[in-house]
């Protein structure tokens, strides 16, 4: 019957994905038992995305590669609500790479997934960005203004945040 075949397909997908993410945490979306949305364990979920806080210290380029081999990218922050969710899982004494860089040092900031950079939805600390040689963005905590973005040198190792679309099975 229909439900049996749906379950068989779901198990097949789970097996296929298992070599990349050994454990998935899934929830039923809405009332329809057909739709399960999943994030790898122990990633966190918000709206239609999954997030992973990488505590290994790496350069910006290596951090992005680390995310991409997992099927993700360094985080692209689209709304204040999304940033408010992300910071719940961050440590105040750490800095984390975002998927935001200015490769030419000309203040042409670009998101790694080609999402258009919108000046109206940015959360730079006051006075930032402030150095043309600092071409990668981090999010960190400043006691005076809480969480915000700062430009830093891309080769300086930092923690990072990966983001990917939820996995639907």
């Amino acid at each position: 019957n229909f439900m049996y075949s749906k379950t068989v397909k779901r198990l097949s997908k789970l097996r296929e994905y298992q070599q990349y993410h050994p454990s998935l945490t899934c929830v039923m979306e809405g009332k329809d038992i057909e739709d399960w949305s999943c994030c790898p364990t122990p990633w966190t979920s918000f709206q239609s995305s999954c997030y992973f806080i990488s505590t290994g210290m790496q350069s910006w380029t290596k951090s992005q590669k680390n995310c991409s081999v997992m099927g993700a990218d360094l985080v692209v922050i689209n709304t204040r609500e999304e940033q408010d969710f992300i910071i719940q899982n961050l440590k105040r004494n750490s800095s984390y790479f975002l998927g935001l860089s200015d490769p030419g040092g000309r203040r042409h900031w670009q998101w790694v997934d080609q999402t258009p950079y919108n000046e109206n939805v940015t959360f730079w600390h006051s006075g930032e960005p402030n150095n043309l040689d600092e071409r990668c963005a981090i999010i960190n905590f400043r006691s005076s203004e809480e969480w915000g973005w700062n430009d830093i040198h891309c080769h300086v190792p930092q923690k990072s945040i990966c983001k990917m679309k939820k996995i639907y099975i």
Epitope: E16, Y20, K65, S68, G71, D73, M164, K165
Partner: nanobody
Framework: QVQLQESGGGLVQAGDSLRLSCAAS????????MGWFRQAPGKEREFVAA????????NYRDSVKGRFTISRDNDLNAGYLQMNSLKPEDTAVYYC????????????????????WGQGTQVTVSS
């Protein structure tokens, strides 16, 4: 670990066609979205075309739309770039790239979104 090998490049006249191939090994090809990029002498590498892992979605840079077609055969672990009406400005080294994805329909246009790259194949278009 994924390995990629491009082939099919060469020297052609303006207006001619070429078909580039990208052979993949080392993992389940159908789990990877694919992109083609190119780098002309003295220029940065640029996005050319992308295809989702199922092959259902494609994306092209404006200057090749209507002339280039990206495709894939998941059974053969291969991707292709059919290039028609070639122009001198298409002269470059062409690279294929793969990235793991769990979406069957998403394409990726950012160079840094692809961790796996081939060595490239030279395409030269003379006028």
């Amino acid at each position: 670990q994924v390995q990629l090998q491009e082939s099919g490049g060469g020297l052609v006249q303006a207006g001619d066609s070429l078909r580039l191939s990208c052979a993949a090994s080392g993992d389940t090809f159908s789990m990877y979205a694919m992109g083609w990029f190119r780098q002309a002498p003295g220029k940065e590498r640029e996005f050319v075309a992308a295809i989702s892992r199922s092959g259902s979605s494609t994306n092209y840079r404006d200057s090749v739309k209507g002339r280039f077609t990206i495709s894939r055969d998941n059974d053969l672990n291969a991707g292709y770039l059919q290039m028609n009406s070639l122009k001198p400005e298409d002269t470059a080294v062409y690279y294929c790239a793969l990235r793991l994805t769990f979406s069957t329909t998403t394409t990726y246009t950012g160079e840094l979104q692809y961790p796996y790259w081939g060595q490239g194949t030279q395409v030269t278009v003379s006028s």
